[in-house]
């Protein structure tokens, strides 16, 4: 039975040219996390595998940084980065948990996001 829940940063916004941390946290389960995939719509950004380390999709390699932890740092943001992001947790023995984050990249300096996940 899957008892876990995914906590995410929810809806966040950031400035064009800036950086943002995408973060999910799996709680309420003792299941072992074997792999976390980060996807934007159907596009793979990165994979963090417990045994193999990080795989960053070649098209994002220059502006996606692994971490912190199982999170993902997006750099040099553009308005095209606006959209839904998904963290997909493969766990044993529970199975798969999915979390959703909506990122809005703003042109001006009106972007506000939680300080806990912001890169100065």
């Amino acid at each position: 039975m899957m008892t876990g829940t995914i906590e995410t940063t929810g809806n966040i916004s950031a400035e064009k040219g800036g950086s943002i941390i995408l973060q999910c946290h799996l709680s309420s389960t003792t299941a072992q996390v074997t792999q976390v995939n980060w996807e934007q719509q159907d596009q793979l950004l990165a994979i963090c595998n417990a045994d193999l380390g990080w795989h960053i999709s070649p098209s994002f390699k220059d502006r996606v940084a692994p971490g912190p932890g199982l999170g993902l740092t997006l750099q040099s943001l553009t308005v095209n980065d606006t959209g839904e992001y998904f963290c997909i947790y493969h766990t044993y023995p529970d199975g798969t948990y999915t979390g959703r984050i909506f990122l809005e990249v703003l042109e001006s300096s009106v972007a506000e996001h939680g300080a806990r996940f912001q890169i100065p």
Epitope: L44, N49, D51, H55, S57, P58, S59, K61, T96
Partner: antibody, heavy 119, light 107 residues
């Protein structure tokens, strides 16, 4: 066209070390990891490990730790594998293979380097 | 280590026939499975990755299916160039491992 050009065959003596190369062309070298795979004559495939030229990070199959050392040179787009303390068990074809864009599979392979260990 | 079991070990078929290879794992690997073709004296070539995604340039007569622990590769209407060995490989943990292969021969 994406190509991986591997160095030529090697005849080496037991106990010696050797280093083979894999020159990449037709793509941005630092955007993809490079894997190495062993195949003994008429047998299956064994993954040795990978090197990420972007940050020089590497991961090894536990079986090949201490046997294989993976390095790369960004400036020349060449990946290297050094094999040490060679024995007849190391006689095989060794392939370099580019990592796939969606994970740890192999989307382009070199032609292979044949290593023969014999006295 | 994740064990990969391929069957059959060898298979004889004729041009125009349809064949199916299977690959079984001893633990759940979701859809993280790749199929390769290797001809005698040549390097392997990727056919299908993530269990069902056809690699670039691979003819549509090839198709992959399955998830979890059971996977298959199907070739419709065999062509002369399809004869050779086929390997599966998981990409869900260290070490990455391959099946022992299926040798497809001309009947």
């Amino acid at each position: 066209e994406v190509q991986l050009q591997q160095s030529g065959p090697e005849l080496v003596k037991p106990g010696a070390s050797m280093k083979m190369s894999c020159k990449a062309s037709g793509y941005k070298f630092t955007s993809y990891v490079m894997h190495w795979v062993k195949q003994k004559p008429g047998q299956g495939l064994e993954w040795i490990g990978y090197i990420d030229p972007y940050n020089d990070g590497s991961k090894y199959n536990e079986k090949f730790k201490g046997k294989a050392t993976l390095t790369s040179d960004k400036s020349s787009s060449i990946a290297y594998m050094e094999l040490s303390s060679l024995t007849s068990e190391d006689s095989a074809v060794f392939y370099c293979a580019r990592g796939g864009s969606r994970g740890w599979y192999f989307d382009v392979w070199g032609a292979g380097t044949t290593v023969t260990v014999s006295s | 280590d994740i064990q990969m079991t391929q069957s059959p070990a060898s298979l004889s078929a004729s041009v125009g026939e349809t064949v199916t290879f299977t690959c079984r794992t001893n633990e759940n690997i979701y859809s993280y499975l790749t199929w390769y073709q290797q001809k005698q004296g040549k390097s392997p070539q990727v056919l299908v990755y993530n269990a069902k995604t056809l690699a670039e340039g691979v003819p549509s007569r090839f198709s992959g299916s399955g998830s979890g622990t059971q996977f298959s590769l199907k070739i419709n209407s065999l062509q002369p160039e399809d004869f050779g060995s086929y390997f599966c490989q998981h990409h869900f943990g260290n070490p990455l491992t391959f099946g022992a292969g299926t040798k497809l021969e001309l009947k």
